[in-house]
Protein backbone atom coordinates (compact mmCIF):
# COMPACT_ATOMS: atom_id res chain seq x y z
CA UNK A 1 0.00 0.00 0.00
CA UNK A 2 3.01 2.29 0.30
CA UNK A 3 2.38 3.29 3.91
CA UNK A 4 4.32 0.46 5.52
CA UNK A 5 6.77 2.77 7.28
CA UNK A 6 4.34 5.61 7.85
CA UNK A 7 3.10 6.14 11.39
CA UNK A 8 -0.05 7.92 12.46
CA UNK A 9 0.21 11.14 14.42
CA UNK A 10 -0.55 10.94 18.13
CA UNK A 11 -0.89 13.21 21.17
CA UNK A 12 -2.82 15.75 19.11
CA UNK A 13 -3.14 18.79 21.37
CA UNK A 14 -4.75 22.21 21.01
CA UNK A 15 -2.72 25.20 22.24
CA UNK A 16 -4.79 28.36 22.25
CA UNK A 17 -4.48 31.77 23.90
CA UNK A 18 -6.73 34.73 23.07
CA UNK A 19 -7.87 32.64 20.06
CA UNK A 20 -4.37 32.27 18.61
CA UNK A 21 -4.73 28.53 18.06
CA UNK A 22 -2.14 25.94 17.14
CA UNK A 23 -2.54 22.19 16.84
CA UNK A 24 0.48 20.21 17.99
CA UNK A 25 1.21 16.51 17.61
CA UNK A 26 3.88 13.82 17.66
CA UNK A 27 6.08 12.20 16.42
CA UNK A 28 8.81 14.22 14.76
CA UNK A 29 8.66 12.90 11.20
CA UNK A 30 11.12 10.39 9.83
CA UNK A 31 10.62 9.84 6.11
CA UNK A 32 7.08 11.15 6.28
CA UNK A 33 5.15 14.40 6.00
CA UNK A 34 1.85 15.66 7.40
CA UNK A 35 -1.23 17.51 6.21
CA UNK A 36 -3.86 18.84 8.60
CA UNK A 37 -7.60 19.13 8.02
CA UNK A 38 -10.04 21.04 10.18
CA UNK A 39 -13.84 21.05 10.24
CA UNK A 40 -16.82 22.14 12.24
CA UNK A 41 -19.62 19.61 12.72
CA UNK A 42 -20.60 20.35 9.13
CA UNK A 43 -17.94 17.91 7.94
CA UNK A 44 -16.63 20.48 5.44
CA UNK A 45 -12.99 19.54 5.90
CA UNK A 46 -10.42 22.16 4.93
CA UNK A 47 -6.78 21.24 4.40
CA UNK A 48 -3.99 23.28 6.00
CA UNK A 49 -0.21 22.98 6.44
CA UNK A 50 0.20 20.83 3.35
CA UNK A 51 2.88 18.11 3.37
CA UNK A 52 4.74 19.69 6.26
CA UNK A 53 7.58 18.26 8.30
CA UNK A 54 6.49 20.44 11.24
CA UNK A 55 4.58 18.93 14.12
CA UNK A 56 2.36 21.93 14.60
CA UNK A 57 -0.13 23.82 12.47
CA UNK A 58 -1.55 27.28 13.05
CA UNK A 59 -5.32 26.97 12.67
CA UNK A 60 -6.17 30.44 13.93
CA UNK A 61 -7.49 31.65 10.58
CA UNK A 62 -10.05 28.86 10.55
CA UNK A 63 -11.30 28.95 14.13
CA UNK A 64 -11.72 32.75 14.26
CA UNK A 65 -14.37 32.49 11.54
CA UNK A 66 -16.76 31.39 14.27
CA UNK A 67 -15.29 31.01 17.74
CA UNK A 68 -18.50 29.50 19.15
CA UNK A 69 -18.44 26.53 16.80
CA UNK A 70 -16.87 23.24 17.83
CA UNK A 71 -13.94 22.10 15.70
CA UNK A 72 -12.20 18.83 15.02
CA UNK A 73 -8.85 18.50 13.29
CA UNK A 74 -7.18 15.48 11.82
CA UNK A 75 -3.57 14.95 10.88
CA UNK A 76 -2.76 12.84 7.83
CA UNK A 77 0.57 11.05 7.49
CA UNK A 78 2.16 10.46 4.07
CA UNK A 79 5.44 8.83 3.06
CA UNK A 80 7.93 11.54 2.10
CA UNK A 81 8.17 11.70 -1.69
CA UNK A 82 5.04 9.59 -2.20
CA UNK A 83 2.17 11.67 -0.92
CA UNK A 84 -0.32 10.02 -3.27
CA UNK A 85 -0.11 6.65 -1.53
CA UNK A 86 -2.92 5.46 0.71
CA UNK A 87 -3.42 3.02 3.55
CA UNK A 88 -5.22 -0.30 3.47
CA UNK A 89 -8.61 1.40 3.78
CA UNK A 90 -7.99 3.40 0.60
CA UNK A 91 -7.06 6.63 2.34
CA UNK A 92 -3.95 7.97 4.09
CA UNK A 93 -3.25 7.21 7.73
CA UNK A 94 -4.74 9.85 9.97
CA UNK A 95 -5.65 10.61 13.56
CA UNK A 96 -8.36 12.86 14.94
CA UNK A 97 -7.80 15.58 17.53
CA UNK A 98 -9.98 16.14 20.55
CA UNK A 99 -12.89 18.49 19.86
CA UNK A 100 -12.16 22.17 20.47
CA UNK A 101 -14.60 25.02 21.09
CA UNK A 102 -12.56 28.24 21.06
CA UNK A 103 -15.06 30.38 22.95
CA UNK A 104 -15.19 27.88 25.79
CA UNK A 105 -11.59 26.71 25.80
CA UNK A 106 -9.07 29.28 24.56
CA UNK A 107 -6.82 30.41 27.37
CA UNK A 108 -7.21 34.03 28.35
CA UNK A 109 -3.82 35.70 28.11
CA UNK A 110 -2.12 37.31 31.06
CA UNK A 111 -3.87 40.64 31.61
CA UNK A 112 -2.05 43.95 31.80
CA UNK A 113 -2.87 46.84 34.10
CA UNK A 114 -3.20 49.82 31.82
CA UNK A 115 -3.31 52.53 34.49
CA UNK A 116 -4.34 53.37 38.00
CA UNK A 117 -5.56 56.60 39.54
CA UNK A 118 -6.01 57.50 43.19
CA UNK A 119 -8.31 60.27 44.28
CA UNK A 120 -8.63 60.60 48.01
CA UNK A 121 -9.97 57.32 49.36
CA UNK A 122 -10.79 55.88 45.93
CA UNK A 123 -8.47 53.91 43.71
CA UNK A 124 -9.41 53.27 40.09
CA UNK A 125 -7.56 50.46 38.32
CA UNK A 126 -8.03 49.96 34.57
CA UNK A 127 -7.24 46.69 32.82
CA UNK A 128 -6.04 46.89 29.22
CA UNK A 129 -8.59 45.39 26.82
CA UNK A 130 -6.29 43.19 24.77
CA UNK A 131 -6.90 42.56 21.11
CA UNK A 132 -7.64 39.05 19.90
CA UNK A 133 -7.20 37.58 16.43
CA UNK A 134 -10.96 37.50 15.92
CA UNK A 135 -12.06 39.92 13.21
CA UNK A 136 -15.31 41.65 12.40
CA UNK A 137 -15.60 43.73 9.25
CA UNK A 138 -11.83 43.57 8.89
CA UNK A 139 -11.15 44.91 12.39
CA UNK A 140 -9.59 42.89 15.20
CA UNK A 141 -11.88 42.54 18.20
CA UNK A 142 -10.87 42.95 21.82
CA UNK A 143 -11.48 40.35 24.50
CA UNK A 144 -14.39 42.42 25.80
CA UNK A 145 -15.94 42.65 22.35
CA UNK A 146 -15.74 38.88 21.95
CA UNK A 147 -16.78 37.77 25.43
CA UNK A 148 -19.04 40.64 26.50
CA UNK A 149 -20.38 40.16 30.01
CA UNK A 150 -19.00 36.61 30.16
CA UNK A 151 -15.60 38.15 30.90
CA UNK A 152 -14.75 39.48 34.32
CA UNK A 153 -11.65 40.47 36.25
CA UNK A 154 -10.48 39.87 39.80
CA UNK A 155 -8.29 42.44 41.51
CA UNK A 156 -6.03 41.31 44.33
CA UNK A 157 -4.60 44.19 46.33
CA UNK A 158 -2.79 44.98 49.55
CA UNK A 159 -1.15 47.88 51.29
CA UNK A 160 2.53 48.12 50.42
CA UNK A 161 3.28 47.91 54.11
CA UNK A 162 1.14 44.82 54.71
CA UNK A 163 0.77 41.24 53.52
CA UNK A 164 -2.99 41.08 54.09
CA UNK A 165 -4.71 40.73 50.72
CA UNK A 166 -8.18 41.76 49.60
CA UNK A 167 -10.02 41.01 46.37
CA UNK A 168 -12.54 42.84 44.23
CA UNK A 169 -14.46 41.74 41.14
CA UNK A 170 -15.76 43.56 38.09
CA UNK A 171 -17.61 42.70 34.90
CA UNK A 172 -16.02 45.69 33.16
CA UNK A 173 -12.38 46.58 32.72
CA UNK A 174 -12.35 48.96 35.66
CA UNK A 175 -12.20 48.64 39.42
CA UNK A 176 -13.10 51.39 41.86
CA UNK A 177 -12.08 50.40 45.38
CA UNK A 178 -11.92 52.07 48.75
CA UNK A 179 -8.41 52.71 50.04
CA UNK A 180 -6.79 54.54 52.91
CA UNK A 181 -5.73 58.03 51.95
CA UNK A 182 -1.97 58.44 51.79
CA UNK A 183 -1.29 54.71 51.68
CA UNK A 184 0.45 53.03 48.76
CA UNK A 185 -0.99 49.78 47.41
CA UNK A 186 0.24 46.86 45.34
CA UNK A 187 -2.17 44.97 43.12
CA UNK A 188 -2.55 42.49 40.28
CA UNK A 189 -5.47 41.38 38.15
CA UNK A 190 -6.68 38.10 36.77
CA UNK A 191 -9.19 37.55 33.97
CA UNK A 192 -12.05 35.15 34.70
CA UNK A 193 -14.89 33.62 32.71
CA UNK A 194 -17.15 32.24 35.46
CA UNK A 195 -19.46 30.34 33.10
CA UNK A 196 -16.64 28.09 31.89
CA UNK A 197 -15.83 24.63 33.14
CA UNK A 198 -12.22 24.69 31.91
CA UNK A 199 -9.62 27.45 31.60
CA UNK A 200 -11.76 29.69 33.78
CA UNK A 201 -8.96 31.98 34.89
CA UNK A 202 -5.92 33.58 33.33
CA UNK A 203 -2.58 33.85 35.02
CA UNK A 204 -2.12 36.91 37.23
CA UNK A 205 -0.88 40.14 35.73
CA UNK A 206 2.46 41.45 36.88
CA UNK A 207 2.12 43.15 40.26
CA UNK A 208 1.94 46.93 40.15
CA UNK A 209 2.84 49.03 43.18
CA UNK A 210 1.83 52.65 43.55
CA UNK A 211 4.64 55.16 43.61
CA UNK A 212 6.80 53.12 41.28
CA UNK A 213 6.62 55.17 38.09
CA UNK A 214 3.70 53.54 36.28
CA UNK A 215 0.21 54.98 36.51
CA UNK A 216 -1.15 58.30 37.47
CA UNK A 217 -0.97 59.26 41.13
CA UNK A 218 -2.72 62.21 42.55
CA UNK A 219 -4.10 63.31 45.90
Amino acid sequence: SGTTNTVAAYNLTWKSTNFKTILEWEPKPVNQVYTVQISTKSGDWKSKCFYTTDTECDLTDEIVKDVKQTYLARVFSYPAGNVESTGSAGEPLYENSPEFTPYLETNIGQPVIQKYEQGGTKLKVTVKDSFTLVRKNGTFLTLRQVFGNDLGYILTYRKSSSSGKKTAKTNTNEFLIDVDKGENYCFSVQAVIPSRTVNRKSTDSPVECMGQEKGEFRE
Partner: antibody
Framework: EVQLLESGGGLVQPGGSLRLSCAAS????????MGWVRQAPGKGLEWVST????????YYADSVKGRFTISRDNSKNTLYLQMNSLRAEDTAVYYC???????????WGKGTTVTVSS | DIQMTQSPSTLSASVGDRVTITCRAS??????LAWYQQKPGKAPKLLIY???SLESGVPSRFSGSGSGTEFTLTISSLQPDDFATYYC????????FGGGTKVEIK
Protein backbone atom coordinates in the same frame (compact mmCIF):
# COMPACT_ATOMS: atom_id res chain seq x y z
CA GLU B 1 -36.69 19.85 19.43
CA VAL B 2 -34.49 18.35 16.74
CA GLN B 3 -36.58 16.38 14.25
CA LEU B 4 -35.97 14.53 11.00
CA LEU B 5 -38.84 13.28 8.84
CA GLU B 6 -38.24 11.04 5.83
CA SER B 7 -40.61 10.68 2.89
CA GLY B 8 -40.61 9.32 -0.65
CA GLY B 9 -40.40 5.60 0.02
CA GLY B 10 -42.60 3.10 -1.78
CA LEU B 11 -42.75 0.14 -4.12
CA VAL B 12 -40.61 0.31 -7.25
CA GLN B 13 -39.64 -2.20 -9.92
CA PRO B 14 -36.04 -3.37 -10.38
CA GLY B 15 -34.16 -0.86 -12.51
CA GLY B 16 -36.48 1.92 -11.40
CA SER B 17 -35.79 5.16 -9.55
CA LEU B 18 -36.96 6.83 -6.39
CA ARG B 19 -36.09 10.04 -4.56
CA LEU B 20 -36.16 10.14 -0.80
CA SER B 21 -36.44 13.39 1.14
CA CYS B 22 -35.69 14.24 4.74
CA ALA B 23 -37.11 17.42 6.27
CA ALA B 24 -35.06 18.74 9.18
CA SER B 25 -36.11 21.11 11.95
CA UNK B 26 -34.94 22.27 15.36
CA UNK B 27 -31.29 22.92 14.47
CA UNK B 28 -29.18 24.94 12.03
CA UNK B 29 -29.27 22.50 9.15
CA UNK B 30 -26.21 23.79 7.26
CA UNK B 31 -24.04 23.44 10.40
CA UNK B 32 -24.15 19.65 10.22
CA UNK B 33 -23.20 16.84 7.93
CA MET B 34 -26.11 14.53 7.21
CA GLY B 35 -26.33 10.90 6.20
CA TRP B 36 -28.49 8.01 5.08
CA VAL B 37 -28.41 4.58 6.73
CA ARG B 38 -30.54 1.64 5.67
CA GLN B 39 -31.77 -1.56 7.24
CA ALA B 40 -32.94 -4.52 5.18
CA PRO B 41 -35.81 -6.57 6.66
CA GLY B 42 -34.51 -8.56 9.64
CA LYS B 43 -30.95 -7.36 9.07
CA GLY B 44 -28.52 -4.93 10.64
CA LEU B 45 -27.68 -1.32 9.88
CA GLU B 46 -25.79 -0.39 6.70
CA TRP B 47 -24.34 3.05 6.03
CA VAL B 48 -25.34 4.38 2.61
CA SER B 49 -24.07 7.93 2.14
CA THR B 50 -22.97 11.14 3.88
CA UNK B 51 -22.90 14.77 2.76
CA UNK B 52 -21.14 17.73 4.36
CA UNK B 53 -22.98 20.82 5.56
CA UNK B 54 -22.20 22.84 2.44
CA UNK B 55 -22.92 19.92 0.16
CA UNK B 56 -19.37 20.12 -1.14
CA UNK B 57 -18.23 16.73 0.13
CA UNK B 58 -20.10 13.48 -0.47
CA TYR B 59 -19.30 9.89 0.45
CA TYR B 60 -20.91 6.63 -0.62
CA ALA B 61 -20.84 2.96 0.33
CA ASP B 62 -19.42 0.78 -2.43
CA SER B 63 -22.78 -0.99 -2.73
CA VAL B 64 -24.53 2.17 -3.96
CA LYS B 65 -21.71 4.11 -5.64
CA GLY B 66 -22.67 5.24 -9.13
CA ARG B 67 -26.37 4.53 -8.56
CA PHE B 68 -27.32 6.76 -5.62
CA THR B 69 -26.76 10.51 -5.28
CA ILE B 70 -26.98 12.40 -2.00
CA SER B 71 -27.76 16.12 -2.04
CA ARG B 72 -29.18 18.83 0.17
CA ASP B 73 -31.01 22.13 -0.08
CA ASN B 74 -29.99 24.22 2.91
CA SER B 75 -32.55 26.89 2.07
CA LYS B 76 -35.27 24.27 2.51
CA ASN B 77 -33.61 22.35 5.37
CA THR B 78 -33.99 19.21 3.31
CA LEU B 79 -31.75 16.23 2.56
CA TYR B 80 -32.27 14.05 -0.51
CA LEU B 81 -31.27 10.63 -1.77
CA GLN B 82 -31.77 10.00 -5.48
CA MET B 83 -31.78 6.26 -6.06
CA ASN B 84 -31.41 4.93 -9.62
CA SER B 85 -31.01 1.44 -11.08
CA LEU B 86 -32.65 -0.02 -8.01
CA ARG B 87 -32.13 -3.68 -7.17
CA ALA B 88 -33.98 -6.13 -4.96
CA GLU B 89 -31.14 -5.90 -2.41
CA ASP B 90 -31.87 -2.17 -1.98
CA THR B 91 -35.12 -3.09 -0.24
CA ALA B 92 -34.88 -1.62 3.24
CA VAL B 93 -36.00 1.01 5.68
CA TYR B 94 -33.99 4.15 4.90
CA TYR B 95 -33.12 6.40 7.80
CA CYS B 96 -31.96 9.98 7.55
CA UNK B 97 -29.54 11.04 10.30
CA UNK B 98 -27.75 14.13 11.57
CA UNK B 99 -24.05 13.32 11.53
CA UNK B 100 -21.59 15.63 13.32
CA UNK B 101 -18.36 15.80 11.27
CA UNK B 102 -19.86 13.05 9.11
CA UNK B 103 -18.71 10.61 11.76
CA UNK B 104 -21.51 9.33 14.01
CA UNK B 105 -25.28 9.81 13.96
CA UNK B 106 -26.72 11.66 16.93
CA UNK B 107 -30.29 12.15 15.69
CA TRP B 108 -32.29 9.79 13.47
CA GLY B 109 -35.55 10.04 11.58
CA LYS B 110 -38.26 7.39 11.86
CA GLY B 111 -37.40 5.93 8.48
CA THR B 112 -39.14 5.40 5.16
CA THR B 113 -39.59 1.98 3.52
CA VAL B 114 -38.32 1.25 0.03
CA THR B 115 -39.40 -2.01 -1.60
CA VAL B 116 -37.83 -3.09 -4.90
CA SER B 117 -39.86 -5.87 -6.45
CA SER B 118 -41.43 -6.87 -9.72
CA ASP C 1 -12.97 -1.54 4.57
CA ILE C 2 -12.84 -1.94 8.31
CA GLN C 3 -14.96 -4.84 9.57
CA MET C 4 -16.75 -4.67 12.90
CA THR C 5 -17.59 -7.91 14.73
CA GLN C 6 -19.98 -7.94 17.66
CA SER C 7 -20.36 -10.68 20.23
CA PRO C 8 -22.49 -12.28 21.32
CA SER C 9 -25.14 -11.99 18.60
CA THR C 10 -27.82 -12.77 21.19
CA LEU C 11 -27.67 -12.33 24.94
CA SER C 12 -30.26 -13.52 27.45
CA ALA C 13 -30.37 -11.56 30.68
CA SER C 14 -32.62 -10.56 33.55
CA VAL C 15 -33.55 -7.19 34.98
CA GLY C 16 -30.77 -6.02 37.31
CA ASP C 17 -28.04 -8.00 35.51
CA ARG C 18 -24.76 -6.41 34.48
CA VAL C 19 -24.51 -6.83 30.73
CA THR C 20 -21.40 -6.51 28.57
CA ILE C 21 -21.33 -6.45 24.77
CA THR C 22 -18.07 -6.65 22.83
CA CYS C 23 -17.17 -5.10 19.50
CA ARG C 24 -13.93 -5.87 17.64
CA ALA C 25 -12.49 -3.91 14.72
CA SER C 26 -10.45 -5.57 11.97
CA UNK C 27 -7.80 -2.86 12.41
CA UNK C 28 -7.12 -0.11 14.91
CA UNK C 29 -9.77 2.59 15.00
CA UNK C 30 -8.32 4.46 17.99
CA UNK C 31 -11.39 5.63 19.96
CA UNK C 32 -13.59 6.40 16.98
CA LEU C 33 -16.51 4.18 17.89
CA ALA C 34 -20.19 4.77 18.61
CA TRP C 35 -22.86 2.57 20.18
CA TYR C 36 -26.57 2.61 19.30
CA GLN C 37 -29.71 1.07 20.74
CA GLN C 38 -32.57 -0.01 18.50
CA LYS C 39 -36.00 -1.30 19.47
CA PRO C 40 -38.22 -3.22 17.03
CA GLY C 41 -39.88 -0.93 14.50
CA LYS C 42 -38.01 2.11 15.80
CA ALA C 43 -35.02 4.17 14.66
CA PRO C 44 -31.64 3.62 16.31
CA LYS C 45 -30.66 5.90 19.18
CA LEU C 46 -27.12 7.10 19.90
CA LEU C 47 -25.84 6.00 23.32
CA ILE C 48 -22.07 6.47 23.24
CA TYR C 49 -19.61 8.19 20.90
CA UNK C 50 -15.83 8.39 20.89
CA UNK C 51 -15.84 4.97 22.61
CA UNK C 52 -16.73 6.29 26.06
CA SER C 53 -18.54 9.66 25.80
CA LEU C 54 -22.14 9.37 26.98
CA GLU C 55 -24.64 11.11 24.72
CA SER C 56 -26.74 13.76 26.43
CA GLY C 57 -29.89 12.32 28.01
CA VAL C 58 -28.64 8.71 28.05
CA PRO C 59 -28.86 7.04 31.48
CA SER C 60 -25.57 6.66 33.33
CA ARG C 61 -26.01 2.89 33.61
CA PHE C 62 -24.68 2.78 30.03
CA SER C 63 -20.92 3.07 29.63
CA GLY C 64 -18.40 2.42 26.92
CA SER C 65 -14.72 1.55 27.05
CA GLY C 66 -11.86 0.37 24.90
CA SER C 67 -9.55 1.65 22.21
CA GLY C 68 -7.66 0.27 19.27
CA THR C 69 -9.50 -2.86 18.18
CA GLU C 70 -11.51 -4.00 21.21
CA PHE C 71 -14.47 -2.17 22.73
CA THR C 72 -17.21 -2.89 25.22
CA LEU C 73 -20.63 -1.50 25.99
CA THR C 74 -21.70 -2.15 29.57
CA ILE C 75 -25.13 -1.80 31.10
CA SER C 76 -24.49 -1.77 34.84
CA SER C 77 -27.99 -2.82 35.88
CA LEU C 78 -30.32 -3.91 33.11
CA GLN C 79 -33.73 -2.21 33.13
CA PRO C 80 -36.93 -3.37 31.39
CA ASP C 81 -36.49 -0.56 28.84
CA ASP C 82 -33.04 -1.87 27.86
CA PHE C 83 -34.19 -5.03 26.06
CA ALA C 84 -33.25 -4.11 22.49
CA THR C 85 -30.62 -4.64 19.81
CA TYR C 86 -27.30 -2.82 20.18
CA TYR C 87 -24.98 -1.85 17.34
CA CYS C 88 -21.40 -0.56 17.32
CA UNK C 89 -20.17 1.71 14.54
CA UNK C 90 -16.65 2.75 13.61
CA UNK C 91 -15.95 6.12 12.04
CA UNK C 92 -12.20 5.94 11.65
CA UNK C 93 -12.44 5.16 7.95
CA UNK C 94 -15.79 5.88 6.36
CA UNK C 95 -18.55 4.18 8.37
CA UNK C 96 -19.25 0.52 9.15
CA PHE C 97 -21.61 -1.05 11.67
CA GLY C 98 -21.29 -4.24 13.65
CA GLY C 99 -23.83 -6.98 13.06
CA GLY C 100 -25.77 -6.21 16.25
CA THR C 101 -26.36 -7.84 19.62
CA LYS C 102 -29.91 -8.65 20.66
CA VAL C 103 -30.47 -8.42 24.42
CA GLU C 104 -33.51 -10.51 25.26
CA ILE C 105 -35.33 -11.49 28.44
CA LYS C 106 -34.01 -14.68 30.03
Amino acid sequence: EVQLLESGGGLVQPGGSLRLSCAASGFTFSDYAMGWVRQAPGKGLEWVSTISGSGGLTYYADSVKGRFTISRDNSKNTLYLQMNSLRAEDTAVYYCAKAPYGYYMDVWGKGTTVTVSS
Amino acid sequence: DIQMTQSPSTLSASVGDRVTITCRASQSISSWLAWYQQKPGKAPKLLIYKASSLESGVPSRFSGSGSGTEFTLTISSLQPDDFATYYCQQYKSYITFGGGTKVEIK
